[in-house]
C-alpha cells in the first residue's frame, strides 16, 4: 500500500517551535508572529513496526526535503540526526528501523521513542535555541512532550 | 531448532478465564515478537493480538475488553488470558513467532506451535 | 480492517493435477501476503510469503504470485501429501487477517 503521510509542524511543551540549524540539525526556540514560517514542516508517514495499541510507529521527514530524522550510536550513544535518503526511495512502508519512531500520546501530548533505542525519546532542553536531541529520561529536565499542528 | 508448545487446561466453564502458556526455545523472547491465533473446530483461522520483544501488546480489537498477554523473557514464557468465556470462545489456540524482519517482512509468523484445544463449557 | 477473499473454499484434484487458488485483499498490501497449509490435526506450516518466496525446505511445485490486491497460490504438480487446507494471511497491517480458507481434497 502507499504509504500514508501527512504533514504537520511539532511544538514542545514550552511552545517551542523547530528550526533548521545549519544543513543537519534541529533546535528548539520560541517563535513568535512571522518567525513561524521559519519553523519545519514535518511529513509524517504511518509506516511498519512494532505496533501496539498505545504506539503508532512513524518516520518523520522533512517536507521537500529528502532527509529523515533517524537513531544512530555515536560515541556508544544514541544519538539522533538528519539523514539525507534518496527520494526515489523514500518515504516507503517499510523503513529501516532506525528511521521509525513509535508516537505515544498521553493526555493530548506526543511522545516520540526511538523503536531502534526503546526508551530514548525525540528532546529539546529547557533553554532556548538549543539542539533537538535523544534523551535517555521522560520526565525530568529535558522535555519529550509535544503538540502537533497539521498544515495543509 | 525453533519450537513452540502451549499448555493450558483443556475446559474452561462460562464466565471464568481462560489462561495458556506458550514456552518457547530456539529464539529469545526479547528479540521476537510472538502473536496468538485461534481455531474453532471446523472453521478458519483467528488472528487474537501479539507481544513484542519490547513487551508492547495488541490486542485485536473485537477481544481486546477481554485479553491480556504477557511474558516472562527469562521463562521463555509467553501467556494468554482471556476473561469472560463463553462457548464462543472454544477453539484450537495456537502461538506463533512473528518473523521480525525489519523493512522486509515484520509482520508475518513463520513457526507455530501444535495447538491447545480448550472447550467451555460447563 | 483489511478482508481477505480466498476462493475456491473447496476444490477437488486429482494427483497430478495443477491447482490455483486465489486470494483478494479489501485494499492495497504490496507484497504483504502469505500462504499455509494446514493439515488436520496439525498447526498451518508457512509456504511462502512476501507473496513469491518460497520458504526453505518447501518443494518447488509451490508458487506464489501477485501484488497489490490480487494473490494467485499454485500446486504445479498434486503430489498425495498436498491435500489439505491452505490459508493465506495479510501481513500489511493490524490486525493481521486471514482468508477463510480453501480444503483441497482427493477427486
Known amino acids: 500500500a502507499p504509504v500514508r503521510s501527512l504533514h504537520c509542524t511539532l511544538r514542545d511543551a514550552q511552545l517551542k517551535s523547530l528550526v533548521m540549524s545549519g544543513p543537519y540539525e534541529l533546535k528548539a526556540l520560541h517563535l513568535q508572529g512571522q518567525d513561524l514560517e521559519q519553523q519545519v514542516v514535518f511529513s509524517m508517514s504511518f509506516v511498519q513496526g512494532e505496533e501496539s495499541n498505545d504506539k503508532i510507529p512513524v518516520a518523520l521527514g522533512l517536507k521537500a526535503k529528502n532527509l529523515y530524522l533517524s537513531c544512530v550510536l555515536k560515541d556508544d550513544k544514541p544519538t539522533l540526526q538528519l539523514e539525507s535518503v534518496d527520494p526515489k526511495n523514500y518515504p516507503k512502508k517499510k523503513m529501516e528501523k532506525r528511521f521509525v519512531f513509535n508516537k505515544i500520546e498521553i493526555n493530548n501530548k506526543l511522545e516520540f521513542e526511538s523503536a531502534q533505542f526503546p526508551n530514548w525519546y525525540i528532546s529539546t532542553s529547557q533553554a532556548e535555541s538549543m539542539p533537538v536531541f535523544l534523551g535517555g529520561t521522560r520526565g525530568g529536565q529535558d522535555i519529550t512532550d509535544f503538540t502537533m499542528q497539521f498544515v495543509s | 531448532e525453533v519450537q513452540l508448545q502451549e499448555s493450558g487446561p483443556g475446559l474452561v466453564k462460562p464466565s471464568e478465564t481462560l489462561s495458556l502458556t506458550c514456552t518457547v526455545s530456539?529464539?529469545?523472547?526479547?528479540?521476537?515478537?510472538v502473536s496468538w491465533i485461534r481455531q474453532p473446530p471446523g472453521k478458519g483461522l483467528e488472528w487474537i493480538g501479539l507481544i513484542w520483544g519490547s513487551g508492547d501488546t495488541y490486542y485485536n480489537s473485537p477481544l481486546k475488553s477481554r485479553l491480556t498477554i504477557s511474558k516472562d523473557t527469562s521463562k521463555s514464557q509467553v501467556s494468554l488470558k482471556l476473561s469472560s468465556v463463553t462457548a464462543a470462545d472454544t477453539a484450537v489456540y495456537y502461538c506463533a513467532k512473528q518473523t521480525n524482519l525489519w523493512a522486509y517482512d515484520l509482520y508475518s509468523m513463520d513457526y507455530w506451535g501444535q495447538g491447545t484445544l480448550v472447550t467451555v463449557s460447563s | 480492517d483489511i478482508q481477505m477473499t480466498q476462493s475456491p473454499s473447496s476444490l477437488s484434484a486429482s494427483v497430478g493435477d495443477r491447482v490455483t487458488i486465489t486470494c483478494q485483499a479489501s485494499?492495497?498490501?504490496?507484497?504483504?501476503l502469505n500462504w499455509y497449509q494446514q493439515k488436520p490435526g496439525k498447526a498451518p506450516k508457512l509456504l511462502i510469503s512476501?507473496?513469491?518466496i518460497l520458504r526453505p525446505g518447501v518443494p518447488s511445485r509451490f508458487s506464489g504470485s501477485g501484488s497489490g490486491t490480487d494473490f494467485t497460490f499454485t500446486i504445479s504438480s498434486l503430489q498425495p501429501e498436498d491435500f489439505a487446507t491452505y490459508y493465506c494471511l495479510q501481513s500489511d497491517s493490524f490486525p493481521l487477517t486471514f482468508g477463510q480458507g480453501t480444503k483441497l481434497e482427493i477427486k
Open positions: 530456539g529464539f529469545s523472547l526479547s528479540d521476537y515478537g
Open positions: 485494499q492495497d498490501i504490496d507484497d504483504d
Open positions: 512476501l507473496a513469491s
